[in-house]
C-alpha cells in the first residue's frame, strides 16, 4: 500500500466545543434545504478500496474540494455559521498541505472524482448537499487524521 506522510492533525483541532457545534449547526441548516435525500456524498462508496492509512489523504482531497468548489462560492449563505466554519476548515486544510501519498493514488482520486462529479451534476443542490454533510466531513477527518 502507498505510504502517507505528514497526514496527521492534532486531536485538539476536534476538541473545541464551540466550532464543533457551529460546524454541526451549519450542516443541519443546509440539510434542511437539501431535498435530495437519496444521494450521499460521504459514505461507503467514498471509502471503498481505501485502506485506513490512506484515509486522511482521501479526506484532505475532499476537504480541499469542499472549500474551493462549495464553501467559498456559497460563503454568503447560512450565516452566521458559514463565516466561522470556513476559516476553521481552511486552517485544517492548511495543516494538511504537506499530507501526501508516496506511490499510486489513482484509486483515491477515482473515488474523490466520483464525489466531485456528483456535486457538479446536481449543481447548486449538490453544493447544498455537500454543506449538509459537513458533520460527516468533520467526523471523517477526525477519525482518519488524528
Amino acid at each position: 500500500a502507498p505510504i502517507s506522510s505528514h497526514c496527521r492533525l492534532d486531536k485538539s483541532n476536534f476538541q473545541q466545543p464551540y466550532i464543533t457545534n457551529r460546524t454541526f449547526m451549519l450542516a443541519k441548516e443546509a440539510s434542511l434545504a437539501d431535498n435530495n435525500t437519496d444521494v450521499r456524498l460521504i459514505g461507503e462508496k467514498l471509502f471503498h478500496g481505501v485502506s485506513m492509512s490512506e484515509r486522511c489523504y482521501l479526506m484532505k482531497q475532499v476537504l480541499n474540494f469542499t472549500l474551493e468548489e462549495v464553501l467559498f462560492p456559497q460563503s454568503d449563505r447560512f450565516q452566521p455559521y458559514m463565516q466561522e466554519v470556513v476559516p476553521f476548515l481552511a486552517r485544517l486544510s492548511n495543516r494538511l498541505s504537506t499530507c501526501h501519498i508516496e506511490g499510486d493514488d489513482l484509486h483515491i482520486q477515482r473515488n474523490v472524482q466520483k464525489l466531485k462529479d456528483t456535486v457538479k451534476k446536481l449543481g447548486e443542490s449538490g453544493e447544498i448537499k455537500a454543506i449538509g454533510e459537513l458533520d460527516l466531513l468533520f467526523m471523517s477527518l477526525r477519525n482518519a487524521c488524528i
Partner: antibody
Framework: QVQLVQSGAEVKKPGASVKVSCKAS????????IHWVRQAPGQGLEWMGW????????RYAQKFQGRVTMTRDMSISTAYMELSRLRSDDTAVYYC????????????WGQGTLVTVSS | SSVLTQPPSVSVAPGKTARITCGGN??????VHWYQQKPGQAPVLVIY???DRPSGIPERFSGSRSGNTATLTISRVEAGDEADYYC???????????FGGGTKLTVL
Amino acid sequence: QVQLVQSGAEVKKPGASVKVSCKASGYTFSDYYIHWVRQAPGQGLEWMGWVNPDTGGTRYAQKFQGRVTMTRDMSISTAYMELSRLRSDDTAVYYCARDLTGFDPFDIWGQGTLVTVSS
Amino acid sequence: SSVLTQPPSVSVAPGKTARITCGGNNFRNKRVHWYQQKPGQAPVLVIYYDSDRPSGIPERFSGSRSGNTATLTISRVEAGDEADYYCQVWDFLTDSGSFGGGTKLTVL
C-alpha cells in the same frame, strides 16, 4: 467468508474484570473499525465504543469511560474488550461488530459472548 | 432511556405489510440503520443509510424517512420475519452510537 468469531462465555465475580476477544477473518482487519455492543437479558442494544485496528485509537461511550479498555493485536487480527470493576448489571451478551468509517452501519457482527456477573 | 423512540411491539398477519417507526430529534442530517435480531442470535443489518439494502436482504424490506421519523417497512410478511428490530443512528454531538429501544414484530 467475512466473519467475526468471539471467545466463549465467562462467569465472573463482582469487582473482577473480563476480557472478551473478537477474531476477524475474510477481510483486511486494519480497514474496519471494531465496535462493541452489549445486550442485557431481555433488554435492547447498547453501544460501548470502538477501536481503530490500524492505529489502536479508541472512542468509548461516556457511560463506560474509565471502566472499559478496547485493544487489538494486528498480528492475529483480533480485537479485545476488557471491562473492569464488574457489577451484576454488567451481565449481558457482548457483541463485536465492524464498520467502515467509525460512524457507519455495523455490517458484520460476532456471535456474541455471554458474561455473567454473580457472587 | 433511548433517544430513539420505537413502539415496543407490532403485530401483523402473514402476507400483510408491517411498518415499524423510529423517532428522534434532529434526524434530518443523520443516517438511520435498521437491524433484525432473532432470539439467541446476533443482530443482522437489514437497511442502512435510511433506505439502502445490503446484499442478501429480501426486497420485501425497505426503509424511508420523513422529517423526524424513520420507517422500516416489511411487505408480504412471513413467519420467519418474526424478530426484534432496532433502529440506530450515529449521534455526532455526543459522538456515540445510539440504538432505539427495539420493536418486537409478531406474525399472527
